[in-house]
C-alpha cells in the first residue's frame, strides 16, 4: 500500500504559451518555463545575457530542493558542501572537509577520527580479540614422540581490527616450552603429529614467562605479562629446569 498524491492546482498566467517544453506547466517564449509540473524544480539557467526558466526532475549537485505551494525551487548548499538535503544537513563535503552529523568540519571533534577515504568523522575503533584457543599438542620438529622437551602453541582471532587511532591488537599467537613423557617413536610414527599426547603441567606456583619474539618488539604498546625481572629470571633458571616459556606474536 502506498500513499498517493493528487495533482497540485495551478492558475494560468495571462499571455502564456500552452505548448510548453517537457516539465513546464506554464511558459513564455521569452522567459522559458514560468512554473513547473508537480515534483519538478524550477531553476534559472543563464543563456548569454538572458535567464531562462527550466524545470528539473532533481536539483543539480551543490543544490537542494525546497517546496512551496506554488513552486519548487533549487537552492545552493553551503560553500563547504557538495551535496545536501538543506543548508543545515550536508551529505557530502567539499574536498578538505570532514562530514559529521550533517556539518562540514576542518577537524574532527574529540573522540572521533578522520576517515580520509569517506571524508567523514568516525568513531575510534579499538582492537577486539577472541578468547585463546586450546594449546596445541606438545611437539618438536613436527613430532610428538622421541623427545623430552618441545613447544606448544595457542592462537586467538582478531574480531575487530583497530582504526588509525585505536588501540593496537594484543598478541594473537603464543608459544611456550613443554615437556612430555619420553617415548620412542613407533615405526611409521616419525614425523606424525599426535593429538592425544599427555602434557606434564608446570609445577604449582610456577608462572609462565612471556618472551616476545622479534615481531612482538615492533609493538609500541608493552603487554604487562611480558615484563620480567632479570634477577627473577636467573633465580628461576637455577631453581627450575622444567620451566615453560611463552613466545608471543603481535599483529
Amino acid at each position: 500500500q502506498n500513499a498517493s498524491r493528487g495533482r497540485r492546482q495551478r492558475r494560468m498566467h495571462p499571455n502564456v504559451s500552452q505548448g510548453c517544453q517537457g516539465g513546464c506547466a506554464t511558459c513564455s517564449d521569452y522567459n522559458g518555463c514560468l512554473s513547473c509540473k508537480p515534483r519538478l524544480f524550477f531553476a534559472l539557467e543563464r543563456i548569454g545575457m538572458k535567464q531562462i526558466g527550466v524545470c528539473l526532475s532533481s536539483c543539480p549537485s551543490g543544490y537542494y530542493g525546497t517546496r512551496y505551494p506554488d513552486i519548487n525551487k533549487c537552492t545552493k548548499c553551503k560553500a563547504d558542501c557538495d551535496t545536501c538535503f538543506n543548508k543545515n544537513f550536508c551529505t557530502k563535503c567539499k574536498s578538505g572537509f570532514y562530514l559529521h552529523l550533517g556539518k562540514c568540519l576542518d577537524n574532527c571533534p574529540e573522540g572521533l577520527e578522520a576517515n580520509n577515504h569517506t571524508m567523514e568523522c568516525v568513531s575510534i575503533v579499538h582492537c577486539e580479540v577472541s578468547e585463546w584457543n586450546p594449546w596445541s599438542p606438545c611437539t618438536k620438529k613436527g613430532k610428538t614422540c622421541g623427545f623430552k622437551r618441545g613447544t606448544e602453541t595457542r592462537v586467538r582471532e582478531i574480531i575487530q581490527h583497530p582504526s588509525a587511532k585505536g588501540n593496537l591488537c594484543p598478541p594473537t599467537n603464543e608459544t611456550r616450552k613443554c615437556t612430555v613423557q619420553r617415548k620412542k617413536c613407533q615405526k611409521g610414527e616419525r614425523g606424525k603429529k599426535g593429538r592425544e599426547r599427555k602434557r606434564k603441567k608446570p609445577n604449582k606456583g610456577e608462572s609462565k614467562e612471556a618472551i616476545p619474539d622479534s615481531k612482538s618488539l615492533e609493538s609500541s604498546k608493552e603487554i604487562p605479562e611480558q615484563r620480567e625481572n632479570k634477577q627473577q629470571q636467573k633465580k628461576r633458571k637455577v631453581q627450575d629446569k622444567q620451566k615453560s616459556v611463552s613466545v608471543s606474536t603481535v599483529h
Epitope: N2, A3, R5, R39, F41, S57, S58, Y64, G65, T66, R67, Y68, N72, T75, T83, F85, N86, K87, N88, F89, T91, K92, L101, G102
Partner: antibody, heavy 117, light 111 residues
Amino acid sequence: QVQLVQSGAEVKKPGASVKVSCKASGYTFTDYSIHWVRQAPGQGLEWIGYIYPSNGDSGYNQKFKNRVTMTRDTSTSTAYMELSRLRSEDTAVYYCATYFANNFDYWGQGTTLTVSS
Amino acid sequence: DIVLTQSPASLAVSLGQRATISCKASQSVDYDGDSYMNWYQQKPGQPPKLLIYAASNLESGIPARFSGSGSGTDFTLNIHPVEEEDAATYYCQQSNEDPLTFGAGTKLELK
C-alpha cells in the same frame, strides 16, 4: 503513479542479518534519495538513514552506523537495507520512503522483521 | 539530536470539533526563513502519509480541514472540523538536522 514495493516479512535469530528490498516504479529512480524508517510495535517512527540511488552515496543515523548498510541496484530500481548483528529490539516494521525536498512523500507498505530466539 | 515533544499523547474529539496537536522542538528547526517541520498521519497497518510540509503547507490531495502553523521551536497541527476518517496517530518530523527525528505521536480518537 509512484510506487514503492517492499519485500516480505522476515523472522531472524539474534546475531543474524537481514536484507530488506524496496522496488521503486512510476518515477526516475535516480532522481530522489530513498530513506529507511522503522517502527517498533506500538512505538513511534525512527529514521535509520538514506541512499542516493544516482551514485550510491549513503548516510546513517549514528545509532545504526556500525550495523546498517544501504545499497541499490539501478538496473532494477531497487534499494536495499541490510541490518546485521540483530537483537530483539530490532523487531519492527521497516519502511522505505522517497525524500522529496525535505519530506517523505511516498512510502513503501512496510516489511515486518521479527527477531526471536 | 533534535528532540520533538508532542502533546497531548492522546486526545478524544467529537465529530465536527477542533483537534489541536502541539509539537515542541528542543532547538530551532528554522533556517534561512524556512521551517523544516512536517506532519504525518498514520492509521493502523498502514505507512505514514504526508499532510503538511514546511510547517504550514498543505500537501496536494489533503483536505483543507488540516492546517499547520508555527516556526522556530513551536508548531501546531489543527484539524477542523474533525471527521470520522481522521481517527489516527499524528507525527511531527524535523528535516533541519542530522539525524532526522520524529515526535512520539499523538493518537486522535473520536468521542
